[in-house]
């Protein structure tokens, strides 16, 4: 059976922007040579703020009569970039956003690239292979991650507050140890989410409280020690986990230690 | 049932032109792109070019510009590649094969036919 | 034009054993996320036969003790349990834009 494994390539441009293209070798659904030729989607997250590359199938110019990209944006109507190799002509319909355009030459590279990726590219995306027997299709469905911006704190006594501020999609907070909280979720317009976890301790040995914030762009865990007397200075630290330690808590400061990165966070 | 069937082996005399045939069956004729690739005694598979028959495109080896040439008859299904200007070195088995769309590959190949060019 | 180079060029298995083979590409014959490599197995008198296409997709119909890896420039083709009928001769095969054989490599009994 073909490989279905996924190859997600990243790379830096200009040493600042991450790229990433997400082209898999697909399952080729092709047969007995059935003109109802491979139609494969795949669910796609990318960054925010980053380049992406979106691919067709690996089917060589010279077999080719038209490649199209189809673009479904939320609230817009379709886009379709089309390149006709006989007249070696490119053609765009109800195409606005300049930031979405061909990686190359259609006749040298039928890739897409998104520039930047933003909130409003959540879509799908459908490159259209036309040959002289069938088509080929390669569907994404493009899943746009906000990362959440962490903050950790304690607003009463031996209560804690754990907000993951503006992510996409929603983040989860799970609390050690476990405590008795309450989660609330604040959907904005722009298709972000903030979450936030109160917790309260009863039982008096408890001392220091971790907040894990897990997200699809990276995980994120802040400490604090609970402090009997209200009003009194507190202090969240944290470390990431996973491969990705990529939270940017506001108000935190970044130290480096022998333990990895320290976040102090001071309440005031 | 997919079927590529060459002509038969040929013997031919140093600067004389050779042409071979390749008749498909089981598939539309003018879907697929058509590649010759040749095979001499003991040497590497080599890319001698292929056809379109869909708009008669053509491309070439850099080694065999000139001397191949490639055509197709659509009524017949059938792709021909002429060589003309032969040697001994042109001595080998030559193959006609379709290259799928996906990936660019090779699921079906003529059974071969074998040029001898010998004096 | 991008060569392959097949390494070995011949070697001498028993049945049973685990075979590997590679081809080196002169540069990436990657682009798009895809290794548009394949490998093929031919027999005296006959044309050759696709085992693995875009690197590391078993061609329909072929045993699945074929497999095939790699990406960018160096690739594998392994038999992990060689079979009387496997001995042949082996050519990579890349066709992108311009189509190239591997050397090959002739697999023979011990």
């Known amino acids: 059976q073909p490989n279905n494994s996924l190859m997600l390539q990243t790379s830096k441009e200009n040493h600042a922007l991450a790229s990433s293209s997400l082209c898999m070798d697909e399952k080729q659904i092709t047969q007995n040579y059935s003109k109802v030729l491979a139609e494969v989607n795949t669910s796609w997250p990318v960054k925010m703020a980053t380049n992406a590359v979106l691919c067709c199938p690996p089917i060589a110019l010279r077999n080719l009569i038209i490649i199209t990209w189809e673009i479904i944006l939320r609230g817009q109507p379709s886009c379709t970039k089309a390149y006709k190799k006989e007249t070696n002509e490119t053609k765009e319909t109800n195409c606005t956003d300049e930031r979405i355009t061909w990686v190359s030459r259609p006749d040298q590279n039928s890739d897409l690239q998104i520039r930047t990726v933003a909130i409003t590219h959540d879509g799908y995306y459908r490159c259209i292979m036309v040959t002289p027997d069938g088509n080929f299709h390669r569907g994404y469905h493009l899943q746009v991650l906000v990362t959440p911006e962490v903050t950790l704190f304690q607003n009463r006594n031996r209560t804690a507050v754990c907000k993951a501020v503006a992510g996409k999609p929603a983040a989860h907070i799970s609390w050690i140890p476990e405590g008795d909280c309450a989660t609330k979720q604040e959907y904005w317009s722009n298709g972000t989410v903030t979450v936030k976890s109160t917790c309260h301790w009863e039982v008096h040995n408890v001392s220091t409280v971790t907040c894990h914030v897990s997200h699809l762009t990276g995980n994120k865990s802040l400490y604090i020690e609970l402090l009997p007397v209200p009003g009194a200075k507190k202090s969240a630290k944290g470390g990431g986990s996973g491969l990705n330690d990529i939270f940017e808590a506001q108000k935190i400061e970044w130290h480096e230690g022998s333990g990895g990165h320290h976040h102090h966070h001071h309440h005031h | 049932e997919v079927q590529l069937v060459q002509s038969g082996a040929e013997v031919k005399k140093p600067g004389a032109s050779v042409k071979v045939s390749c008749k498909a069956s089981g598939y539309t004729f003018t879907s697929y792109v058509m590649f010759w690739v040749r095979q001499a005694p003991g040497q590497r598979l080599e890319w001698i070019g292929y056809?379109?028959?869909?708009?008669?495109?053509?491309k070439y080896n850099e080694k065999f510009k000139g001397r191949a040439t490639l055509t197709s008859d659509k009524s017949a299904s059938t792709a021909y590649m002429e060589l003309s200007s032969l040697r001994s070195e042109d001595t080998a088995v030559y193959y006609c094969a379709r290259e799928d769309y996906y990936g660019s590959r090779f699921v079906y190949w003529g059974q071969g036919t074998l040029v001898t060019v010998s004096s | 034009d991008i060569q392959l180079t097949q390494s070995p060029s011949s070697l001498s298995a028993s049945v049973g054993d685990r075979v590997t083979i590679t081809c080196r590409a002169s540069k990436s014959v990657s682009t798009s996320g895809y290794s548009y490599m394949h490998w093929y197995q031919q027999k005296p008198g006959k044309p050759p036969k696709l085992l693995i296409y875009?690197?590391?997709n078993l061609e329909s119909g072929v045993p699945s003790r074929f497999s095939g890896s790699g990406s960018g420039t160096d690739f594998t083709l392994t038999i992990s349990s060689l079979q009387p009928e496997d001995f042949a001769t082996y050519y990579c095969q890349h066709n992108r834009e311009l189509l190239t054989f591997g050397g090959g490599t002739k697999v023979e009994i011990k």
């Open positions: 056809i379109n028959p869909y708009n008669d495109d053509t």
């Open positions: 875009l690197a590391s």
